[in-house]
Amino acid sequence: MKVLQEPTCVSDYMSISTCEWKMNGPTNCSTELRLLYQLVFLLSEAHTCIPENNGGAGCVCHLLMDDVVSADNYTLDLWAGQQLLWKGSFKPSEHVKPRAPGNLTVHTNVSDTLLLTWSNPYPPDNYLYNHLTYAVNIWSENDPADFRIYNVTYLEPSLRIAASTLKSGISYRARVRAWAQCYNTTWSEWSPSTKWHNSYREPFEQH
């Protein structure tokens, strides 16, 4: 039994880090493997993560963490029984993938303006809470070419757009994702999408 692709890990900078790797053949990850992780800190102890299968030869492990600070560094040991398959380290602050925003809502009752709001996925005491920026994706269910991205570079988790920038009388979907420039994070996963029917009064034309 050998590791084909070494574990790579990302942290949500809150309570979970996710490590993925591939074995050289089909593996029952939860029964055959264990990922031990330990914070490099005085009097810390090793903790065990039981991996799950992620495709035939792929494994994924969700490492629970109390919290994360920038100085944290973890040692990682991948074991198959008594055999050490791989040894590495992981600094969560250098591999951050933010949590996905939630509760995306489209408010259509504000004159001819669409107001999209969502929730910041972090509590106020988390460092990332005040450092997230967002991308909002809006697309038409009827027209695959009608696909647009709005970058939200301010902290408020909301976006206002004129309803008239979208076609009237058809359904649209929106989703949002987040990233944090301060830690050069990857983008989060997209939030679940929300659907609405876009309709607005055409401006009165005088001839």
Partner: antibody, heavy 125, light 112 residues
């Protein structure tokens, strides 16, 4: 009441051995790291050794490394310090102290918040 | 090893007056925001040491609020707002960020 009680001190000749014990009560012993600190007559405090709650990780002062061994028996709620190759400079009052909560991913530190009454070790010929 | 240097080594104080003890470390003891791994202990004559302050500024359970800790990085201070007769003894700072733990030399507080 959280309490630590040391025992095992005494008079020993240079080169001899002693085993100190520290019995803990009133807290979940296995969850906490433990530490030994000593104080030579008329001197300040000197850290000796520490051990994690599971006993898997141990740390020693250079002055005792290779001669002293820290261990614990969580089933008996007891901490030990095996002292071999004793020297005159090991003469001191030895204290055990409750250290950080080490079972969590990040050990939670509340200071050395409980100390034993101390046990005296005298090394002399 | 991290060296902890205390001053003054002797501190005569009039009861009711404030007192201040300084402790300087040779390396930063700040691990994360607000968490400096420095403690303050008081050892009264013939007794075991007792914890006063941990993580730089957190008062231990049962410690009177006249004791306070402050500082960050390498410079720390223990303050007693109004010294009482029962406060006499030796005060030690200690770092617990890295092994070996190291103590300051101790400050003897005595009543004038």
């Amino acid at each position: 009441e959280v309490q630590l009680v040391e025992s095992g001190g005494g008079l020993e000749q240079p080169g001899g051995s002693l085993r100190l014990s520290c019995a803990g009560s009133g807290f979940t012993f296995r969850d906490f790291a433990m530490t030994w600190v000593r104080q030579a007559p008329g001197k300040g405090l000197e850290w000796v050794s520490s051990i994690s709650g599971s006993g898997d990780n141990t740390y020693y002062a250079d002055s005792v490394k290779g001669r002293f061994t820290i261990s614990r028996d969580n089933s008996k709620n007891t901490l030990y310090l095996q002292m071999n190759s004793l020297r005159a400079e090991d003469t001191a009052v030895y204290y055990c102290a409750k250290d950080r909560l080490s079972k969590t991913i990040r050990p939670r530190y509340y200071g050395l918040d409980v100390w034993g009454q101390g046990t005296t070790v005298t090394v002399s010929s | 090893d991290i060296v902890m240097t205390q001053s003054p080594l002797s501190l005569p104080v009039t009861p009711g007056e404030p007192a201040s003890i300084s402790c300087t470390s040779s390396q930063s003891l700040l691990y994360s925001i607000g968490k400096n791994y420095v403690d303050w202990y008081l050892q009264k004559s013939g007794q075991s040491p007792q914890l006063l302050i941990y993580l730089g500024n957190k008062r231990a359970s049962g410690v009177p609020d006249r004791f306070s800790g402050s500082g960050s990085g390498t410079d720390f201070t223990l303050k007693i707002s109004r010294v009482e007769a029962e406060d006499v003894g030796f005060y030690y700072c200690m770092q617990s960020l890295t092994s070996p733990y190291t103590f300051g030399q101790g400050t003897k507080l005595e009543i004038k």
